[in-house]
């Protein structure tokens, strides 16, 4: 008599199981297991019992234990049932937008999963079950029809599979598809209202407002504002069933002339549009031209101011002579001119309104280096052993590098706190150097010895 344990097993796909084959006779001629599965025998004492590890179980299988005893041969089967959740649970794509009242078909496809007898497909709206059916066929397909309502807006539809292995002592395995969100809409027949300036200056900003009532759902409405080919980026404020879209519009010289301002409202697959014209005029800022923005000290510099042909300009507060769109001044660059601003102001009359524009340019003057008594004293007298900080500031643009050397070799630590010793005494040659040249200055350090009374 051959027996097997366990006689029935449910296990996950790819799993392993221990199967014991036993025989009632003490000295069987043969005791083993017949199976296509990978097996490994575990060594046990005695001859009438063998334990096998069966691994990588991919599908249902019926391994058979057999034994050959003096009184004959016998067999016993164990039933291995493999379970696995579906490999694909998918809801067929839904059109994004649906008008209220339309019938919508939901279709769910399920691939794989076993055992099929324990597999159920459920169609849901949110957590509400719309339909529940056993999984049949490969792939299994379940469909249902929904009448779209206003309150369905934003509802999530999904498909779920349930592999119920609780009767076998396991759990309920659930797989859920990616949700599909339904969007419903109502767009009124009236066009949007558009408020904007009728004229707009090049290189300035204007404000455009577009609004519409009677929308559902108002938060899902797309508003497209455009001036000619230029898309605007509005800030949208919502009411219960209305919106107001506000945008800044910037225009360039290329937009000069009459432009079409458009406001389009798109909801679902419908749209409403309003058109208006805007006149754009040009008045660029005046141009300040320096012969060179960076010059050496003593260089002649011409500063020119040029503006719109119909404008009148002033340069550094002095009106053009004669009054018109051009002005200029001449100067010889001095160190004091370094960083000096040259400002041009232009005035243009547009439709009876005076418009002002300014532009400023800065002059950089390269000069120096300079070493003078005020910033680099020629004489220091310090008490011996006192703490002192030698100071010597070189001026120039670019800022010069400075070195002070005694006998061409001993540096004076400029800007550092030093303890005054006899070694510090002497005459130092301070040399300031930059790309603009080099200057030298002698600095004498005297050290006063302490008096002993």
């Amino acid at each position: 008599q051959t027996s097997v344990s366990p006689s029935k097993v449910i296990l996950p796909r790819g799993g392993s199981v221990l199967v014991t084959c036993s025989t009632s006779c003490d000295q069987p001629k043969l005791l083993g297991i017949e199976t296509p599965l990978p097996k490994k025998e575990l060594l046990l004492p005695g001859n009438n019992r063998k334990v096998y590890e069966l691994s990588n179980v991919q599908e249902d299988s019926q391994p058979m234990c057999y034994s050959n005893c003096p009184d004959g041969q016998s067999t016993a089967k164990t039933f291995l049932t493999v379970y696995w959740t579906p490999e694909r649970v998918e809801l067929a794509p839904l059109p994004s937008w649906q008008p209220v009242g339309k019938n919508l078909t939901l279709r769910c496809q399920v691939e794989g999963g076993a055992p099929r007898a324990n597999l159920t497909v459920v169609l849901l709206r949110g957590e509400k079950e719309l339909k529940r059916e056993p999984a049949v066929g490969e792939p299994a397909e379940v469909t249902t029809t929904v009448l779209v309502r206003r309150d369905h807006h934003g509802a999530n539809f999904s498909c779920r599979t349930e592999l119920d292995l609780r009767p076998q002592g396991l759990e309920l395995f659930e797989n859920t598809s990616a949700p599909y969100q339904l969007q419903t809409f109502v767009l009124p027949a009236t066009p949007p209202q558009l408020v904007s300036p009728r004229v707009l200056e090049v290189d300035t900003q204007g404000t455009v407002v577009c609004s519409l009532d009677g929308l559902f759902p108002v938060s899902e409405a797309q508003v497209h504002l455009a001036l000619g080919d230029q898309r605007l980026n509005p800030t949208v404020t919502y009411g219960n069933d209305s919106f107001s879209a506000k945008a800044s519009v910037s225009v360039t010289a290329e937009d000069e002339g009459t432009q079409r301002l458009t406001c389009a409202v798109i909801l679902g697959n419908q749209s409403q549009e309003t058109l208006q014209t805007v006149t754009i005029y040009s008045f660029p800022a005046p141009n300040v031209i320096l012969t060179k923005p960076e010059v050496s000290e003593g260089t002649e510099v011409t500063v020119k101011c040029e503006a719109h042909p119909r404008a009148k300009v002033t340069l550094n507060g002095v009106p053009a002579q004669p009054l018109g769109p051009r002005a200029q001044l001449l100067l010889k660059a001095t160190p004091e001119d370094n960083g000096r601003s040259f400002s041009c102001s232009a005035t243009l009359e547009v439709a009876g309104q005076l418009i002002h524009k300014n532009q400023t340019r800065e002059l950089r003057v390269l000069y120096g280096p300079r070493l003078d008594e005020r910033d680099c004293p020629g004489n220091w007298t310090w008490p011996e052993n006192s703490q002192q900080t030698p100071m010597c500031q070189a001026w120039g643009n670019p800022l010069p590098e400075l070195k002070c050397l005694k006998d061409g070799t001993f540096p004076l630590p400029i800007g550092e706190s030093v303890t005054v010793t006899r070694d510090l005494e002497g005459t130092y040659l301070c040399r300031a150097r930059s790309t603009q040249g080099e200057v030298t200055r002698k600095v004498t350090v005297n050290v006063l010895s302490p008096r002993y009374e």
Epitope: K403, L405, D407, G408, T409, F410, P411, E416
Partner: antibody, heavy 117, light 110 residues
């Protein structure tokens, strides 16, 4: 601006050797000049310096053995009683602290002194 | 005495790596420190002056730092051409000196 050493070569121990550094492109009345040596396979060793005034300053180990002097365009290094340990390449160098880092590398190419009997 | 101690004596670095060389003065030399590079058979060439200023024509991967008695030369993104011996030199005092130069650091690039 350049500096170049001369006067190197083979000298017997105990003799006297004078190396000369010739400068061009700058005035020795404005700049200090120094001597540095490097024994074969060894590091740089400061010998001493002559200031723009003509005052001399030596490394503690070099006092009495080396003498630095100058004319309007040359700086001399006199080595008294050289030993084999004085075998080295001798460099003439314009004092580094007059440097503003603008590509300043006022070292001569060096002259090799070999002290051997 | 205003003498210099340089560490390490030798260092090995891979191409693209970073090398740090330290130099210590026996007394305060403020920022009066130079760094030189010397390749075999050549005269030394100035890299850094005033402890941290780059001499003209020197690549920015060389960086000097420190003041007083502690100074560092850092070479970042080392290239094979950087294989050389590097020396520090104090330039504060020409008298009261045993050796104004550090002992040197040999940089070997792998």
């Amino acid at each position: 601006q350049s500096v170049e050493e001369s006067g190197g070569g083979l000298v017997k121990p105990g003799g006297t050797l004078t190396l000369t550094c010739t400068v061009s492109g700058f005035s020795l009345s404005s700049y200090a000049m120094g001597w540095v040596r490097q024994a074969p396979g060894k590091g740089l060793e400061y010998i001493g310096i002559i200031g723009s005034s003509g005052s001399t300053y030596y490394a503690s180990w070099a006092k009495g053995r080396f003498t630095i002097s100058k004319t309007s365009t040359t700086v001399d290094l006199k080595i008294t009683s050289p030993t084999t340990e004085d075998t080295a390449t001798y460099f003439c160098v314009r004092d580094p602290y007059d440097s503003f880092g603008d590509g300043y590398r006022l070292w001569g190419p060096g002259t090799l002194v070999t002290v051997s009997s | 005495a205003y003498d210099m101690t340089q560490t390490p004596a030798s260092v090995e670095v891979a191409v693209g790596g970073t090398v740090t060389i330290k130099c210590q003065a026996s007394e305060n030399i403020y920022r009066y420190l130079l760094w030189y590079q010397q390749k075999l058979g050549q005269r030394p060439s100035l890299l850094i002056y005033d402890a941290s200023k780059l001499a003209s024509g020197v690549p920015s991967r060389f960086k000097g730092s420190g003041s007083g008695t502690e100074f560092t030369l850092t070479i970042s993104g080392v290239q094979s051409d950087d294989a050389a011996t590097y020396y520090c030199q104090q330039a504060y005092s020409s008298s009261n000196v045993d050796n104004a130069f550090g002992g040197g650091t040999e940089v070997v690039v792998k």
